[in-house]
Amino acid sequence: EPPTACSDKQYLHDGQCCSLCQPGQKLVSDCTEFTETECLPCGESEFLDTWNRETHCHQHKYCDPNLGLRVQQKGTSETDTICTCEEGWHCTSEACESCVLHRSCSPGFGVKQIATGVSDTICEPCPVGFFSNVSSAFEKCHPWTSCETKDLVVQQAGTNKTDVVCGPQDRLR
């Protein structure tokens, strides 16, 4: 009796279980009762990343420098090219088809996580006792200056955007 189902690395063709082509190869001809599935390696700049019965290999992704992209990992016959963004930029999606400039954290906010080629800067508001007075993609919130350790007193309270202002202690006359 002809099979109705085949194993995970086979496919049903004309009532017969044929071997799938291995990753990196494409289908040239289906198996018969006398010959196995005929497969051929993908060409330069092509790939197939699964056991398959595809008659054409996929083209490697092009990392377009005009979109701020560059090659992070060159593709093989079994894997696609992985793109990333130039320094200071990050991908707009998981597929990394285009790039945008890293976000800067405004005054009053510090960098919680520095951006990578695939993720944007993550900012956090500076909590009490910390400040940031610049717009930056790298600067964290800085702690207020400790006037006491300098034998000074606070003359002007700090905010999330400004440091405290220290001054000399008042002398008894």
Partner: antibody, heavy 117, light 107 residues
Framework: EVQLLESGGGLVQPGGSLRLSCAAS????????MSWVRQAPGKGLEWVSG????????SYADSVKGRFTISRDNSKNTLYLQMNSLRAEDTAVYYC??????????WGQGTLVTVSS | DIQMTQSPSSLSASVGDHVTITCRAS??????LNWYQQKPGKAPKLLIY???SLQSGVPSRFSGSGSGTDFTLTISSLQPEDFATYYC?????????FGQGTKLEIK
């Protein structure tokens, strides 16, 4: 016990025809693909033709395509090879063989076909 | 069609010898290769299928290896009944094709 017995060989003139038969026994004939393989005197083996178990698929070597026809009668457990427009280079011992998962596991004893004027 | 080339074409050896016959395909055939033995006046007999699997009833002194384009049939210790002609046959691409044969003779 699996047995394959070829018959129908003989002397034929160039351009003539011949039909070979292969009687099968000892297995469920309709479940197996079958083939014909030939061997010219003092030469190597040449795959000639094959047929699927249900007769749905047939295949031929380029050297015989259009001249030879493979067929089977599952009710009679018999494989056939109709050979037309025979040439001197078709002279050979013709073997029928049972196919099992891409290999020929049982062979007949062969029948000699001589094409000569 | 895929061309199968066997070497050597003929080989003289003695009982007890270790013998290797090679078969080369004109393009990659993965492990889609069978080996047959044929004695004069007899039908071929299957020895090895899928490059390295021993057919039931065949002595374990016969072994096959290889993949891609290069394959070998090895007889570890020749016995008198092993003197015959050996053929490789590919099934990686239609039509199936045989090598030209290797004749193993007594030295």
């Amino acid at each position: 016990e699996v047995q394959l017995l070829e018959s129908g060989g003989g002397l034929v003139q160039p351009g003539g025809s011949l039909r070979l038969s292969c009687a099968a026994s000892g297995f469920t004939f309709s479940s197996y693909a079958m083939s014909w393989v030939r061997q010219a005197p003092g030469k190597g083996l040449e795959w000639v033709s094959g047929i699927g178990g249900s007769s749905s698929y047939t295949s031929y070597a380029d050297s015989v395509k259009g001249r030879f026809t493979i067929s089977r009668d599952n009710s009679k457990n018999t494989l056939y090879l109709q050979m037309n427009s025979l040439r001197a280079e078709d002279t050979a011992v013709y073997y029928c063989a049972r196919y099992y998962s891409y290999h020929m596991d049982y062979w007949g004893q062969g029948t000699l076909v001589t094409v000569s004027s | 069609d895929i061309q199968m080339t066997q070497s050597p074409s003929s080989l003289s050896a003695s009982v007890g010898d270790h013998v290797t016959i090679t078969c080369r395909a004109s393009q990659s055939i993965s492990s889609y290769l069978n080996w047959y033995q044929q004695k004069p006046g007899k039908a071929p007999k299957l020895l090895i299928y899928a490059a390295s699997s021993l057919q039931s009833g065949v002595p374990s002194r016969f072994s096959g290896s290889g993949s891609g384009t290069d394959f070998t049939l090895t007889i570890s210790s020749l016995q008198p009944e092993d003197f015959a002609t050996y053929y490789c046959q590919q099934y990686g691409s239609a039509p199936p094709t045989f090598g030209q044969g290797t004749k193993l003779e007594i030295k």
